[in-house]
């Protein structure tokens, strides 16, 4: 994990109000009772900061110890700081919990850059602004780490929401969400609305502002506009999906669709950027450069290193293209597309130039481990992780940042043939050789 890249995002003040709307008629297939409607107690339960992650408040132990926990759909361990660390304001103190049980087993998680290690146990866990339940869950008590916690990020642990297959030390360690569903009547589904501010926030603004919502067990109508479109979860490990086509300003990249999913495509709230396989990244950047050719930017900008600044309020959004990803639909030979704006893929950066400037980093980057639809994508959409039906839904987020000319979009259906051929089949290897890092 390279936190500057792998951990998400700016939170913040979205454009549209987040107040609840009345449920309305849609053309979607009917859902079973209890899965839809109003989840007022969970709306606005996320906070965060640019590039540093969205977090939810959780309590652990008896009596309850309150911690802020990073919401990460790209991993499967519930792990919390459990020893003093210079970047932690607080940490889980197992000795103070009467309900803590030691599993007498260690866990070690190395990343591309950095690592954490700790001791496994179980304890009682609840989410104050979530379902009114308490569950006994596995907890990795982090005793040692390197380049994992982020100074000033305000979170003390990580909630891995993906599947057991990628849990550490192995798939026998039940992830938190599996425990929640097994032990309660919470439906096997959660949804995320991550709200990018569109401008950098300082620490006090982050604490006072909305970062978004994690709706556990359902879908809240107030958080999206238009219809939800679903793509199948290809395999239950990461939240793996299949991209069948990519367009820049409506121009097809015209690559073999296998390239878009080489070696996988995942939806990951724990990654800041939209990360693309090398060949796809190079083609996409070439196309974005061509579309924005009235202005030129240094190579370091396209590499996500240098910042580009404009006088406050003069960012030329119009010269940058929209990016559309077509995802496999639920119906044979049918796809739909999600479209993001430069307001999503140019990430506001704070504290670098004067207050008279708006500065940005290019938040699309190269990957050697497949496509990662990180916060750059998720900030445009309300994303439903429908585990029960093995599918992920996308709708336009009510809080996405846009301008008067363009908006993020979810549109379909489109006819796309041979979509199954777009998936890449990873050669089976010994699990111990799998790469943990998502840098």
């Amino acid at each position: 994990t390279q936190h500057g890249i792998r951990l998400p995002l700016r939170s913040g003040l979205g454009g549209a109000p987040l107040g609840l709307r009345l449920p309305r008629e849609t053309d979607e297939e009917p859902e079973e009772p209890g899965r839809r409607g109003s989840f007022v107690e969970m709306v606005d339960n996320l906070r965060g900061k640019s590039g540093q992650g969205y977090y939810v408040e959780m309590t652990v132990g008896s009596p309850p110890q309150t911690l802020n926990i990073l919401v990460d759909t790209g991993s499967s361990n519930f792990a919390v700081g459990a020893a003093p660390h210079p970047f932690l304001h607080r940490y889980y103190q197992r000795q103070l919990s009467s309900t803590y049980r030691d599993l007498r087993k260690g866990v070690y998680v190395p990343y591309t850059q950095g690592k954490w290690e700790g001791e496994l146990g179980t304890d009682l866990v609840s989410i104050p602004h979530g379902p009114n339940v308490t569950v006994r869950a596995n907890i990795a008590a982090i005793t040692e780490s390197d380049k994992f916690f982020i100074n000033g990020s305000n979170w003390e642990g990580i909630l891995g929401l993906a599947y057991a297959e990628i849990a550490r030390p192995d798939d026998s360690l039940e992830p938190f969400f599996d425990s929640l569903v097994k032990q309660t009547h919470v439906p096997n589904l959660f949804s995320l609305q991550l709200c990018g501010a569109g401008f950098p926030l300082n620490q006090s603004e982050v604490l006072a502002s909305v970062g978004g919502s994690m709706i556990i067990g359902g879908i809240d109508h107030s958080l999206y506009t238009g219809s939800l479109w679903y793509t199948p979860i290809r395999r239950e490990w990461y939240y793996e999906v299949i991209i069948v086509r990519v367009e820049i300003n409506g121009q097809d990249l015209k690559m073999d669709c296998k390239e878009y999913n080489y070696d996988k495509s995942i939806v990951d709230s724990g990654t800041t950027n939209l990360r693309l396989p090398k060949k796809v990244f190079e083609a996409a950047v070439k196309s974005i450069k061509a579309a924005s050719s009235t202005e030129k930017f240094p190579d370091g900008f396209w590499l996500g290193e240098q910042l580009v600044c404009w006088q406050a309020g003069t960012t030329p959004w119009n010269i940058f293209p929209v990016i559309s990803l077509y995802l496999m639909g639920e119906v044979t030979n049918q796809s739909f597309r999600i479209t993001i704006l430069p307001q999503q893929y140019l990430r506001p950066v704070e504290d670098v130039a004067t207050s008279q400037d708006d500065c940005y980093k290019f938040a699309i980057s190269q990957s050697s481990t497949g496509t990662v639809m990180g916060a750059v994508i998720m900030e445009g959409f309300y994303v439903v992780f429908d585990r029960a039906r093995k599918r992920i839904g996308f709708a336009v987020s009510a809080c996405h940042v846009h301008d008067e000319f363009r908006t993020a979009a979810v549109e379909g259906p489109f006819v796309t043939l041979d979509m199954e051929d777009c998936g890449y089949n990873i050669p089976q290897t010994d699990e111990s050789t799998l790469m943990t890092g998502r840098a």
Epitope: E295, F297, P298, G300, E305, Q306, L307, C309, V352
Partner: antibody
Framework: QLQLQESGPGLVKPSETLSLTCTVS??????????WSWIRQPPGKGLEWIGN???????YYNPSLKSRVTISVDTSKNQFSLKLSSVTAADTAVYYC????????????WGRGTLVTVSS | EIVLTQSPATLSLSPGERATLSCRAS??????LAWFQQKPGQAPRLLIY???NRATGIPARFSGSGSGTDFTLTISSLEPEDFAVYYC??????????FGGGTKVEIK
């Protein structure tokens, strides 16, 4: 080889507009590999970036000068120009035009500079 | 705003001596830093770009190092023509705008 040459009045009255032109010779101002820049240096002091222009006309200005600065390009004459309005004695400086090269990052070629004095 | 602080303000050395000039950024600029030389009555000349790459035609006695916030320009053995003012400039924030205050290298 490419050369840059500044030209314009050496004396400007307070409250008036300073106008300078930079002529590019030995190459085309329309090369896509470069921005063209103005930088100034008050007597005995350090360097201050004023702004850049691309041959397409796209401009970037120093926020502290933005309200008074206009940079324009004339590709037919292979020239780019600086206008700085409402000048005061604090605008007295040697004004340099420069090429922003090395991937649009570094001022790799400079004119010799021209001293502009603001005085009545 | 990123501020570049150069030290010392003045460096008094003799020809043949080694000169070490420092440039410190108020926050990381990665390796996006340049060094310029300016002689009296002349325009600045690019010496080093990307912290350590010599520009075309610059003698090997000039070298740059550093990344992040701390950078150094070294002149291994001063020649008479090297006595001048040296400026650093960051381009981490683009367009390039911030220069250091300069270090004057004078004959002792």
């Amino acid at each position: 080889q490419l050369q840059l040459q500044e030209s314009g009045p050496g004396l400007v009255k307070p409250s008036e507009t300073l106008s300078l032109t930079c002529t590019v010779s030995g190459g085309s101002i329309s090369w896509s590999s470069y921005y063209w820049s103005w930088i100034r240096q008050p007597p005995g002091k350090g360097l201050e970036w004023i702004g850049n222009i691309y041959y397409s006309g796209s401009t970037y200005y120093n926020p502290s000068l933005k309200s008074r600065v206009t940079i324009s390009v004339d590709t037919s004459k292979n020239q780019f120009s600086l206008k700085l309005s409402s000048v005061t004695a604090a605008d007295t400086a040697v004004y340099y035009c420069a090429r922003l090269g090395h991937g649009y990052n570094y001022f790799d070629l400079w004119g010799r500079g021209t001293l502009v004095t603001v005085s009545s | 705003e990123i501020v570049l602080t150069q030290s010392p303000a003045t460096l008094s050395l003799s020809p043949g001596e080694r000169a070490t000039l420092s440039c410190r950024a108020s926050q990381s600029v990665s390796s996006y830093l340049a060094w310029f030389q300016q002689k009296p009555g002349q325009a600045p000349r690019l010496l080093i770009y990307d912290a350590s790459n010599r520009a075309t035609g610059i003698p090997a006695r000039f070298s740059g190092s550093g990344s992040g916030t701390d950078f150094t320009l070294t002149i291994s053995s001063l020649e008479p023509e090297d006595f001048a003012v040296y400026y650093c400039q960051q381009v981490y924030v683009w367009p390039p705008r911030t220069f250091g205050g300069g270090t004057k290298v004078e004959i002792k």
